[in-house]
Interface confidence: low
Amino acid sequence: LNTTILTPNGNEDTTADFFLTTMPTDSLSVSTLPLPEVQCFVFNVEYMNCTWNSSSEPQPTNLTLHYWYKNSDNDKVQKCSHYLFSEEITSGCQLQKKEIHLYQTFVVQLQDPREPRRQATQMLKLQNLVIPWAPENLTLHKLSESQLELNWNNRFLNHCLEHLVQYRTDWDHSWTEQSVDYRHKFSLPSVDGQKRYTFRVRSRFNPLCGSAQHWSEWSHPIHWGSNTSKENPFLFALEA
């Protein structure tokens, strides 16, 4: 099978996280059907999954994926070597760490092997698509009679991450949020010793090393304080 590879050219929106081009066609045919959009996420800069909605195809089709890096030493076209499948149809590609170059423009091309002219190319800024693992090892320290300090670890260089801390007592209807930058430390200056506090944290690859919008999963919660809030009407509702 001869596969035609489209190398992107012309003007591109360099501020966008991706740039989509489709092959022009002269007549209405299968080749005019748009290909599904490819979505890529880099997980903790350990591997990357680029996926598409295979069920959007009019009939089951094993779409193929190629990729390269624009204007770099890694601009050689690569075939996907590890496809992801959904109901035995290709629905994604997984790239390993050595194939990920965060600060070069990643070009990904999806193609219908039965219709070589039916192909779409996207340009992605991978540093904006990093999702870190959830924060780990949450610990609480009592700095004074009423002050708590929350610490945690991330399995990535801390400098690249910002964090969101949420906390609440068993009496609260909702979480209180606080943004924390890469120093991954948070202090709560006024703690009520009669209440039980719950803390959780999530992290994002932003803003020093990238501009990712997606947060990690929430950490496992950590608790502090009284376990006996028998009169608290919200206790059980908040466990969900």
Partner: antibody, heavy 121, light 112 residues
Framework: QVQLQQWGAGLLKPSETLSLTCAVY????????WSWIRQPPGKGLEWIGE???????NYNPSLKSRVTISVDTSKNQFSLKLSSVTAADTAVYYC???????????????WGQGTLVTVSS | DVVMTQSPLSLPVTLGQPASISCRSS???????????LDWYLQKPGQSPQLLIY???NRASGVPDRFSGSGSGTDFTLKISRVEAEDVGVYYC?????????FGQGTKVEIK
Amino acid sequence: QVQLQQWGAGLLKPSETLSLTCAVYGESFSGYYWSWIRQPPGKGLEWIGEINHSGSTNYNPSLKSRVTISVDTSKNQFSLKLSSVTAADTAVYYCARGPAGSSSSGYFDYWGQGTLVTVSS
Amino acid sequence: DVVMTQSPLSLPVTLGQPASISCRSSQSLVHSNGYNYLDWYLQKPGQSPQLLIYLGSNRASGVPDRFSGSGSGTDFTLKISRVEAEDVGVYYCLQGSHWPWTFGQGTKVEIK
């Protein structure tokens, strides 16, 4: 014990490119940013920029258009290039460790010995 | 950029006497996580700077306890309880709460 040893050309002509390298001994590259800081003769300190082990850089906006910091993790080294130098770039240039991601220590806890770079026609 | 202003710029001191240096920032250095990202460095004559104090009031490893840091927000102070001969040099404050990191202009401490 962490040690930073730096070297590079000490005398440049205007419009040339300053090039310095800093080698790190006794410390893994990962987990820290590695910075360049300069000090014009008789003046204060100015932070230039930083790089981590994976090559991610942050630069002082006042110098960003002329600065490139790179890293060679296989040698535990990082380098500074400053293009189109003028007499105003004459300074002692320091490499330093930091900042770390954690707030358990100060921003720059280990420093190189400094390299005097003079720009003169 | 955050401007860091130190005073005095020159400080003649007597051995064994206390000394105090002020550092003011143009913006509050209290970070969203509650900490003041303010370091103090000493640059002895002919040497590279060395870290003395971090987070406003924490002594770095190996720093004598005659050095102390205090303050919060925009006003910070470095105190030397009893000046020794080896304390001469230029003292700099550095803020790490706002990008980019900026230093004060330095305070030169010398023996009278």
